[in-house]
């Protein structure tokens, strides 16, 4: 619609109470340059005036040339495409919307920019791919939507509440399309990570908690096996019996199928966790290990060597 | 046309008090600082103060500060320039001047003047 | 406060004659904004000032162009490129940026 001003910010900024709020902004006035610039807070049109009512945070005829340190509110645009603005600090009765009362010499617009704050710094969200794997390279991700020049942040990683050595890469946003904080890690989990805590925290420039966000990790791995053998140095005689078990320490997912290989051959029949041999011989002397499987794969267990003497 | 208009100069003696006028008009009173601006007679100009009548906020030179009060009506489209304990060095032609711009700041509009002599 | 020193206090020059005032100010007069709120007035004997050039360099409309302003941070300049007998007035320089605002002394441009 050619009758219309054309802005360009975020729909709504989000902050918390004695922080600030950066709202990156362009705009094209339908004729020529803005003469007169206002923000309300939560402007009402009164009909009976023609006039928008509601509390003025900048007038540009007054706040233009008032110091920029004095200001809690400051218009850091121009008269004919930049409306960028700043709210430093921020309070929690800012909420609401913020109305730009834009005035040329013969048109008038109004463009609304919701505000939420809160009262304490909201959490950041944690982002992991659908599908983690033991030992492929992830990327973890936290967001917050959130970024102010007057108020710096950092974001930390932590696992079961220590911080992680992985180098995290931050970057931030400041933009007509968004506003936010972004940290990255890149991260390859082990197996036993599985289950663990990891948490994003949210700092402030003197590294003091603000809030944090924490997920569990799911780490997807082939079946992790512990094999024992009675007896435990796995030397006999001929004639004698031998008890290898197989116990699991952790699979994610559940295990589906179990089997025994003797000298990376499988041994069948035997598809449970306990291989008994009875009156073994002297041609089952070999290694041995037991084998368990789950969606992601095989898991193995270390190879005992069975070494059956004459008798 | 935007037009300043001052009143209320005259002859007063020295501890005694006068209350100056800058009648506006042509414009949105409310939404423009109003400075006032004096002269002593052969001298420069002396910025003396300011007020947003749309707020009342005001600056002040810290030598009138105290003694000397700006205000505004907005329901008259006047400001005013009250003077108390005024001294022989007072005199002067005062001036009401509006910073005429959102962007840019100056005065583009003043008053003709009005001419306050403190003298026994 | 910042004092705003002109130069020189009076001239006396020619119809034509191409004509520099200065105005130093005792500090930087940079607004935080990053502006530099210098103007420059005009005033005839009787008359209210008239403004000419604002923010260092910008002639107010229906000022003619001889008159153009110039400089940056403490030093400045208005040049009457050639002077006309309308031009002989007193001239001001005045900073806007920092309270208390302040005039210069003056400059009287008179007929040689």
């Known amino acids: 619609d050619s009758s219309k001003w054309v802005f360009e910010h975020p729909e709504t900024l989000y902050a918390w109470e004695g922080a600030c709020v950066w709202i990156p902004c362009t705009y094209r006035a339908l004729d020529g340059d803005l003469e007169s610039f206002i923000l309300f807070h939560n402007p009402e049109y009164n009909k009976n005036t023609s006039k928008f009512d509601g509390t003025r945070l900048y007038e540009s005829t007054k706040d233009g040339k008032v110091p920029s340190e004095q200001k809690r509110v400051q218009f850091l645009g121009d008269k004919n495409k930049n409306c960028t603005l700043s709210i430093h600090p921020v309070h929690l009765n800012d909420s609401g919307q913020l109305g730009l009362r834009m005035e040329s010499k013969t048109e008038k617009w109004m463009e609304r920019i919701h505000l939420n704050v809160s009262e304490r710094p909201f959490p950041p969200h944690i982002q992991l791919p659908p599908e983690i794997q033991e030992s492929q390279e992830v990327t973890l991700t936290c967001l917050l939507n959130f970024s102010c020049y007057g108020y710096p942040i950092q974001l930390q990683w932590l696992l079961e509440g220590v911080p992680m050595r992985q180098a995290a890469v931050t970057s931030t946003s400041l933009t007509i399309k968004s506003v936010f904080t972004r940290s990255e890690l890149k991260f390859s989990p082990q197996w036993s990570h599985h289950g663990k805590i990891v948490t994003c925290q949210l700092q402030d420039a003197d590294g003091k908690f603000l809030s944090n966000d924490t997920v569990q990790l799911n780490v997807k791995h082939t079946p992790k096996l512990e094999i024992k053998v009675t007896p435990s140095d796995a030397i006999v005689r001929e004639g004698d019996s031998v008890t290898m078990t197989c116990e699991v320490s952790s699979s994610n997912p559940e295990y589906t199928t179990v089997s025994w290989l003797k000298d990376g051959t499988s041994l069948k029949k035997q598809n449970t966790f306990t291989l008994n041999l009875r009156e073994v011989t002297k041609d089952q002397s070999g290694k041995y290990c037991c084998q368990v499987s789950n969606d992601v794969g095989p898991g193995r267990s270390e190879e005992v060597f069975l070494q059956v003497q004459y008798a | 046309e935007v037009q300043l208009v001052e009143s209320g100069g005259g002859l007063v003696q020295p501890g005694g008090s006068l209350r100056l006028s800058c009648a506006a008009s042509g414009y949105e009173f409310s939404r423009s600082w109003m400075n006032w601006v004096r002269q002593a007679p052969g001298k420069g100009l002396e910025w003396v103060g300011r007020?947003?009548?749309?707020?009342?906020?005001?600056n002040y030179s810290g030598k009138f500060k105290g003694r000397f009060t700006i205000s505004a009506d907005t329901s008259k489209n006047t400001a005013y320039l009250q003077m108390n304990s005024l001294r022989a060095e007072d005199t002067a032609v005062y001036y009401c001047?509006?910073?005429?711009?959102?962007?840019?700041?100056?005065?583009?509009?003043w008053g003709q003047g009005t001419l306050v002599t403190v003298s026994s | 406060d910042i004092q705003m020193t002109q130069s020189p206090s009076s001239l006396s020059a020619s119809v034509g004659d191409r004509v520099t005032i200065t105005c130093r100010s005792s500090?930087?007069?940079?607004?935080?904004?990053?502006?530099?709120?210098l103007e420059w007035y005009q005033q005839k004997p009787g008359k209210a000032p008239k403004l000419l050039i604002y923010?260092?360099?910008n002639r107010f409309s229906g000022v003619p162009s001889r008159f153009s302003g110039s400089g940056s941070g403490t030093d400045f300049t208005l040049t009457i490129s050639s002077l006309q007998p309308e031009d002989f007035a007193t001239y001001y320089c005045f900073q806007g940026s920092q309270f208390p605002y302040t005039f210069g002394q003056g400059t009287k441009v008179e007929i040689k």
């Open positions: 001047a509006r910073d005429g711009s959102s962007w840019d700041w100056y005065f583009d509009v």
């Open positions: 500090q930087s007069i940079v607004h935080s904004d990053g502006n530099t709120f």
């Open positions: 923010k260092v360099s």
């Open positions: 007020i947003y009548p749309g707020d009342g906020d005001t």
